[in-house]
């Protein structure tokens, strides 16, 4: 058993039919020594009396309040959850396995630049009951600060019968440098408590490998005289590192028909502008990468072609 | 230490070409070592980072742009004496920031070259013969020292008399190749803003 | 307007070979152009396209041919010739893409014998 | 991707009424475009769209269709019409002829 935060303990168990489970002995915070009983939940029932109560945790009906009391009056609170560990592995039921990049990813991070911000966020079925809270640090032996804000729902989805939720989190690195070449990698680690069932995630990563950088902005088409040609022009996303010479973007220009079976016209160059073939009912769609180091892709930035 | 923006014109500046082909050559050798390495631990997150030039240059402070050293966390108090003088430099304003910056890269490329002659020399002997050094990525590392020309000791090639032990060179090798591709990345940022300025 | 190919002529097996294609009255960099063949007696075979700079090849033709613009020429190079290559060689405009091809030159007669 | 054109030849009267078939292999949406060559001659785009008459066609010839199955009807065929015939498929990574069909004009 272990504090996960003031009053709240967490219980490590192994989760199989007839488990002995733990034996928890949990202390009334009072100078009180007599006349103290204790109960569970909202129950009156009492479990048992004195400044110490015994019990043996095997299942989710023995978590929860344990609350002790002297005359009516409340003394003191424990709150007992479980974390369920199934053929040696902590289970994962509060968040979806997202399967992007590898199988077994329940959280996924992105930043913008380089600039030590970072974005993560995750999915789960459960709509109620739920809380998350986050930590990060640059290192795990000596590790360097990340401070993240509180959890939010960003999104909702249905997906079939289910509706999907997605929550995410702003991270920044307290002293980052942008042209520094990282060589421990940011660790996130994510506490989930749904109900009496408590879970943690981790991911960790480098800034460099979780690029993703804003789509180019101001994209505008000039038709050359005479040609079915044009000349496309973009600039550099707002959020992207400066200076844009140390920090460059190499682009992908698409040329895309309205149907996904019309062949593409693909054009990569490190310049803001292209000259490409434009056509009737086909957009024009620009991505941007780092030039350097190949981290993902943006998203497009797309006009129509007429 | 920064790099201040009065550099050599854009296009007089040799190295960038060089730099370029140095991150492409690097890139695809390490993505070659993680394919033909596939059962060892190869790959970013399952090796340990480490930086050979760490205390001995300090390329990414001695190179950073003019814009970031308003930036407290850019700034670190590591000294390092370069030599000054290179054929990149292309330019009499050049200042001794610049050379300073050039000097480290040139240090750094003495110093992986070092490694990966010794380590190729001892991969040669590998009955297995599974894995060796791209020649290409060598002679890129050569081209690249040649463009920046700058005068300094010969560092003698490590040997070593006892019997190597191959699965821990290719780890080495691993390790190695990961740490100059983010050095050739590094290197290829400051050419790239050198060029432009 | 018009096309005309150029570069065909008599090799033997396993000699390269490139063939041209040129415009007048229009520019060939404003369309995607495509390269057809046609076997003596024989049916019309899609070789391979080039948009602005993306390429697409007929599974058949991947690797050993090449097809490449400038601003004034469209080629296509090939390689490993055999006797099955000897074909009268076409370049064509699209008019949209590949597939709707308004306007073709004459031809050029590629011979693959030894 | 694979066209399979059908008839490989067809026999009609002047006046008559042509009808050539072309079946893609897989939904190529209205990505076809039919041809007519003559002997010694380059080919000639007709149709294109599936359906579009290409300016200066004569309006005899018609396509129809789209998916995976194409129709190209000539209907009051004249001598001129003698020539063989080619549809033309495209999907996102490749271009495919049919087989061709002979018309001729008896």
């Known amino acids: 058993i272990w504090e996960l935060k003031k009053d709240v303990y967490v219980v490590e168990l192994d989760w199989y039919p007839d488990a002995p489970g733990e034996m928890v002995v949990l202390t009334c915070d009072t100078p009180e020594e007599d006349g103290i009983t204790w109960t569970l939940d909202q129950s009156s029932e009492v479990l048992g009396s004195g400044k110490t109560l015994t019990i043996q945790v095997k299942e989710f009906g023995d978590a929860g309040q344990y609350t002790c009391h002297k005359g009516g009056e409340v003394l003191s609170h424990s709150l007992l959850l479980l974390h369920k560990k199934e053929d040696g592995i902590w289970s994962t039921d509060i968040l979806k396995d997202q399967k992007e990049p590898k199988n077994k990813t329940f959280l996924r991070c992105e930043a913008k630049n380089y600039s030590g911000r970072f974005t993560c966020w995750w999915l789960t079925t459960i709509s109620t009951d739920l809380t998350f809270s986050v930590k990060s640090s640059r290192g795990s032996s000596d590790p360097q600060g990340v401070t993240c804000g509180a959890a939010t729902l960003s999104a909702e989805r249905v997906r079939g019968d289910n509706k999907e939720y997605e929550y995410s989190v702003e991270c920044q690195e307290d002293s980052a440098c942008p042209a520094a070449e990282e060589s421990l990698p940011i660790e996130v680690m994510v506490d989930a408590v749904h109900k009496l069932k408590y879970e943690n995630y981790t991911s960790s990563f480098f800034i460099r490998d979780i690029i993703k950088p804003d789509p180019p902005k101001n994209l505008q088409l000039k038709p050359l005289k005479n040609s079915r040609q044009v000349e496309v022009s973009w600039e550099y996303p707002d959020t992207w590192s400066t200076p844009h010479s140390y920090f460059s973007l190499t682009f992908c220009v698409q040329v895309q028909g309205k149907s996904k079976r019309e062949k593409k016209d693909r054009v990569f160059t490190d310049k803001t502008s292209a000259t490409v073939i434009c056509r009737k009912n086909a957009s024009i769609s620009v991505r941007a990468q780092d030039r350097y180091y190949s981290s993902s892709w943006s998203e497009w930035a797309s006009v129509p072609c007429s | 230490r920064n790099l201040p923006v009065a550099t050599p014109d854009p296009g007089m500046f040799p190295c960038l070409h060089h730099s370029q082909n140095l991150l492409r050559a690097v890139s695809n050798m390490l993505q070659k070592a993680r394919q033909t390495l596939e059962f060892y631990p190869c790959t970013s997150e399952e090796i340990d980072h480490e930086d050979i030039t760490k205390d001995k240059t300090s390329t990414v402070e001695a190179c950073l742009p003019l814009e970031l050293t308003k930036n407290e966390s850019c700034l670190n108090s590591r000294e390092t004496s370069f030599i000054t003088n290179g054929s990149c430099l292309a330019s009499r304003k050049t200042s001794f920031m610049m050379a300073l910056c050039l000097s480290s890269i040139y240090e750094d490329l003495k110093m992986y070259q070092v490694e990966f002659k010794t380590m190729n020399a001892k991969l040669l002997m590998d009955p297995k013969r599974q894995i060796f050094l791209d020649q290409n990525m060598l002679a890129v590392i050569d081209e690249l020292m040649q463009a920046l020309n700058f005068n300094s000791e010969t560092v003698p090639q490590k040997s070593s008399l006892e019997e190597p032990d191959f699965y821990k060179t290719k780890i080495k090798l691993c390790i190695l190749l990961h740490a100059f591709r983010i050095r050739a990345v590094t290197i290829d940022r400051v050419m790239s803003y050198l060029n432009a300025s | 307007q018009s096309l005309e190919e150029s570069g065909g002529r008599l090799v033997t097996p396993g000699t390269p070979l490139t063939l041209t294609c040129t415009a007048s009255?229009?520019?060939?960099?404003?369309?995607?152009m495509t390269w057809v063949r046609q076997a003596p007696g024989g049916g019309l075979e899609w070789i391979g396209t080039?948009?602005?700079?993306s390429t697409y090849y007929a599974s058949w033709a991947k690797g050993r041919f090449t097809i490449s613009r400038t601003s004034t020429t469209v080629d296509l190079k090939m390689t490993s010739l055999t006797t099955e290559d000897t074909a009268t060689y076409f370049c064509?405009?699209?008019?949209?893409?590949?597939?709707?091809?308004?306007?073709w030159g004459p031809g050029t007669l590629v011979t693959v014998s030894s | 991707l694979v066209m399979t054109q059908t008839p490989a030849s067809v026999s009609a009267a002047v006046g008559g009424t042509v009808t050539i078939n072309c079946q893609a292999s897989?939904?190529?949406?209205?990505?076809l475009a039919w041809y007519q060559q003559k002997p010694g001659q380059r080919p000639k785009l007709l149709i294109y769209?599936?359906?579009t008459l290409t300016s200066g066609v004569p309006s005899r010839f018609k396509g129809s269709g789209s998916g995976k199955q194409f129709t190209l009807t000539i209907s009051g065929v004249q001598r001129e019409d003698a020539a063989t015939y080619y549809c033309?498929?495209?999907?996102?990574?490749?271009?495919?002829f049919g087989g061709g069909t002979k018309v001729v004009v008896v």
């Open positions: 064509a405009r699209g008019l949209t893409t590949d597939y709707d091809l308004d306007l």
């Open positions: 897989e939904d190529i949406e209205s990505y």
């Open positions: 080039i948009a602005t700079s």
């Open positions: 033309l498929g495209a999907d996102d990574t490749t271009t495919v």
């Open positions: 009255g229009f520019s060939l960099s404003s369309y995607w």
């Open positions: 769209s599936a359906s």
